[in-house]
């Protein structure tokens, strides 16, 4: 062991640049710090074979496999991958260690496998083996967290059955409404599964892993708050756990809380109470109603009553499978060029949806906001006044929903013209869709007022890229107009635009654009 060189194998991850092939070099890229791969002499091997930890990377990731050799004198090397030899250029670092690198750019299935590095130094020969595979992310899942009571303790456990195992955090807020937004200073995050402080105003549990982040809010009725105009509604699927928290504050301890389902008291074992004194010596009581696995007959009005507060209710609806309720009829909008406007979709869904807004094959993040009436809303304002088709797509574990929107921007036509030997064509994408006139310019009509009606053909076509309509008009060439200047004009309620074309022989035409408002 003592006469062998000290070998260090590392993996360097790169933030991807657009490239595609493996290179045996030091390639300029933004890199993370090297990760040790625990290179060690492979047991029972014939010859000196070092092996690095098995490497597993995402598709399209870029990495460098690197070996640092602490051995005196020069080294020569050769990479072998799938029986092909790859060029190898060792260099020396500041500590005079030999450095050999293999860059794999944009990892693909064909680049997975065993990479062998043969090194020859003045003292000895040895081989280093790297095994590189593609991570199977198809097995990854991220499930919405749910609550369980901790055995023998007044505490809630947050559970998310996800792969890879998620980081679970409680997100707590003690103020009302807008100030409980995720990044607000009023929000406190606790990265732990068990929560003992259950008296806060707003309690959520979130789970995050490589697939993203999912959260569940602890459904709460606050008897000190004015009830919502519409009855709060909670949806659950058969088999899911039900948790409702009833909270009340009073000047002293002389009050009690009870839960009823459809006017019948909840059975023992389906509720538990906690109480504490707040800073101003008032008493806070909370009473949890819970069912570890709901059935259809757990549907109904759950009412929390207090001897000192008006009672409040929530409607719990148990469904067999999830749903997304919204109107899917397509909607058309026309707006002015600088008018502020947002698309919006109002929906009721359970479980919570994942959604995207799409325009011209590009997806945009989708935000949803809960409304007081049990509905949610998603708005999209980032259209940058580009006309065309916008698509809202939503899905949850059980349902999918798609809604189409068309956005038209009111504007004066802009005319483009082209001509061939047999015809002249003009195009415009103004809105409302323009009407067309063709005029002939001649000695008799130097101002081009002589209208052409023969041989004109108008049509509207969908420009596929944005889903926006383009109107065109084509004039078939006749002997009567050959050699003359003609003018095509597009007009709508916002103005007129014209283009003048010289009709002579095929080839590039000089176009003169007239803008007439």
């Amino acid at each position: 062991n003592q006469d062998l060189p000290v070998i260090k194998c590392v993996l360097i991850n790169h933030k991807n640049n657009d490239s595609s092939v493996g290179k045996s070099s030091s390639y300029p890229m933004v890199s993370e710090s090297p990760e040790d791969l625990g290179c060690a002499l492979r047991p029972q091997s014939s010859g000196t074979v070092y092996e690095a930890a098995a490497v597993e990377v995402d598709v399209s990731a870029s990495i460098t496999l690197q070996v640092l050799v602490d051995a005196p004198g020069n080294i020569s090397c050769l990479w072998v991958f799938k029986h092909s030899s790859l060029n190898c250029q060792p260099h020396f670092d500041l500590q005079n260690r030999g450095v050999v690198s293999m860059v794999i750019l944009k990892m693909t299935e064909t680049q997975a496998g065993e990479y062998l590095l043969f090194i020859q130094s003045e003292a000895t020969n040895y081989t280093i083996l790297f095994t590189v595979s593609i991570r199977n992310t198809l097995l990854y899942t991220l499930r919405r967290p749910y609550f369980r009571k901790m055995e023998n303790q007044d505490a809630l456990v947050c559970i998310s059955e996800s792969v890879p195992e998620p980081i679970v955090e409680w997100v707590l807020c003690d103020s009302q409404g807008e100030s409980c937004k995720e990044e607000s200073p009023a929000v406190v995050k606790k990265e732990e599964k068990v929560l003992h402080e259950l008296f806060g105003t707003d309690i959520r549990c979130c789970a995050r892993n490589e697939l993203g982040r999912e959260c569940t809010r602890l459904f709460t009725i606050d008897l000190n708050q004015t009830p919502q105009t519409t009855l709060p509604q909670l949806f659950l699927k058969v088999g899911e756990p039900l948790w409702i928290r009833c909270k009340a504050v009073h000047v002293n301890h002389g009050f009690g809380l009870t839960w009823e389902l459809e006017n019948k008291a909840l059975e023992e074992g389906n509720y538990f109470e906690m109480s504490t004194y707040s800073t101003n010596r008032t008493m806070i009581r909370i009473l949890f109603a819970f069912v570890s696995s709901v059935a259809r007959n757990d549907t109904g009005y759950y009412t929390c009553s207090s001897s000192k507060h008006p009672s409040q209710s929530a409607l719990v609806t148990i469904v067999e499978k999830g749903f997304i309720n919204a109107t899917n009829s397509s909607e058309d909008y026309e707006i002015d060029q600088y008018e502020e406007f947002c698309f919006s979709v109002r929906f009721k869904a359970y479980p919570q949806i994942r959604c995207t807004w799409t325009f011209s094959r590009k997806s945009f993040p989708c935000e949803q906001k809960g409304l007081d009436n049990g509905y949610s809303i998603s708005k999209f304002c980032n259209h940058k006044h580009q006309p065309g088709e916008y698509i809202f797509h939503a899905e949850n574990d059980d349902a999918q929903f798609t809604k189409m929107f068309t956005l038209n921007i009111r504007r004066k036509p802009q005319v483009l013209a082209e001509a061939s030997a047999s015809q002249a064509s003009c195009f415009s994408d103004g809105y409302p869709l323009p009407s067309w006139t063709w005029k002939k310019c001649s000695d008799k009509s130097p101002n081009c007022t002589e209208e052409i009606t023969e041989g004109v053909w108008n049509r509207k076509a969908n420009r596929k890229v944005f889903g926006q309509w383009v109107s065109s008009s084509t004039l078939n060439m006749s002997e009567a107009i050959k050699g003359f200047l003609v003018k095509c004009c597009a007009y709508n309620s916002l103005g007129t635009s014209c283009e003048t074309i010289l009709l002579n022989s095929p080839g590039p035409f000089p176009f003169i654009q007239d803008n007439i408002s």
């Epitope: 991850n13 791969l37 625990g38 060690a40 029972q44 930890a53 597993e56 083996l129 890879p164």
Partner: antibody, heavy 124, light 112 residues
């Protein structure tokens, strides 16, 4: 340079839950077949393996302590957390975290690097 | 669980002399892939353990060649050809064939 460092309370009361964090550097639990184990050693006694977690999220626990242990990782923070419920004076020990490496050809270098250990005393 | 039994419990050796520690497992540590999942560690006073030998007979990086391991199946031996003062401490064997991983009770080596 591979390093591991254990952190957590030095004193825990009986029945309480112990949470220990192993913060490591020089390697990661994301792209290589690596793992982190927790091992403890009561004063003057032998080593006892508690739990391990691998980069692919595979976990194992000591048979006798399984019901009390939970191991988890935060790849981005380069941390592995061990929680042990219902602590008892017999759990007084130095708790170590150590790295293990898995190789493509099916062998393992177990515990090639260790933390310095953190002494946890369980007493009322 | 696999039980690991180490003998002797302690060993007092003259510097330059050889030393041998035995480790027996309650079941074979030979995996179907041909590897024996047996490891040796040395814990010097006041330090965490350090890996000496992996997969029965492979010296870990930086471990002097006076340390050697041998054996197969259920019987394994760690030998120190010439004990030096820096070799004092407790030696542990460990199996990793299956979880839970288990350690031997340790052998304390001291210098005469």
């Amino acid at each position: 340079q591979v390093t591991l460092k254990e952190s957590g309370p030095a004193l825990v009361k009986p029945t309480q839950t112990l949470t220990l964090t192993c913060t490591f550097s020089g390697f990661s639990l994301s792209n290589a077949r690596m793992g982190v184990s927790w091992i403890r050693q009561p004063p003057g006694k032998a080593l006892e393996w508690l739990a391990h977690i691998f980069s692919n999220d595979e976990k194992s626990y000591s048979t006798s302590l399984k019901s009390r242990l939970t191991i988890s990782k935060d790849t981005s923070k380069r941390q592995v957390v061990l929680t042990m419920t219902n602590m008892d004076p017999v759990d007084t020990a130095t708790y170590y975290c150590a790295r293990m490496v898995g190789y493509g050809s099916g062998w393992y270098a177990y515990f090639d690097y260790w933390g310095q250990g953190t002494l946890v005393t369980v007493s009322s | 669980d696999i039980v690991m039994t180490q003998t002797p419990l302690s060993l007092s050796v003259t510097p330059g002399q050889p030393a041998s520690i035995s480790c027996r497992s309650s079941q074979s540590l030979l995996h179907s892939n041909g590897y024996n999942y047996l490891y040796w560690y040395l814990q010097k006073p006041g330090q965490p353990p350090q890996l000496l030998i992996y997969e029965v007979s492979n010296r870990f990086s930086g471990v002097p060649d006076r340390f050697s391991g041998s054996g197969s199946g259920t019987d394994f031996t760690l030998k120190i050809s010439r004990v030096e003062a820096e070799d004092v401490g407790v030696y542990y064997c460990m199996q990793a064939l299956q979880t839970p991983l288990t350690f031997g009770g340790g052998t304390k080596v001291e210098i005469k």
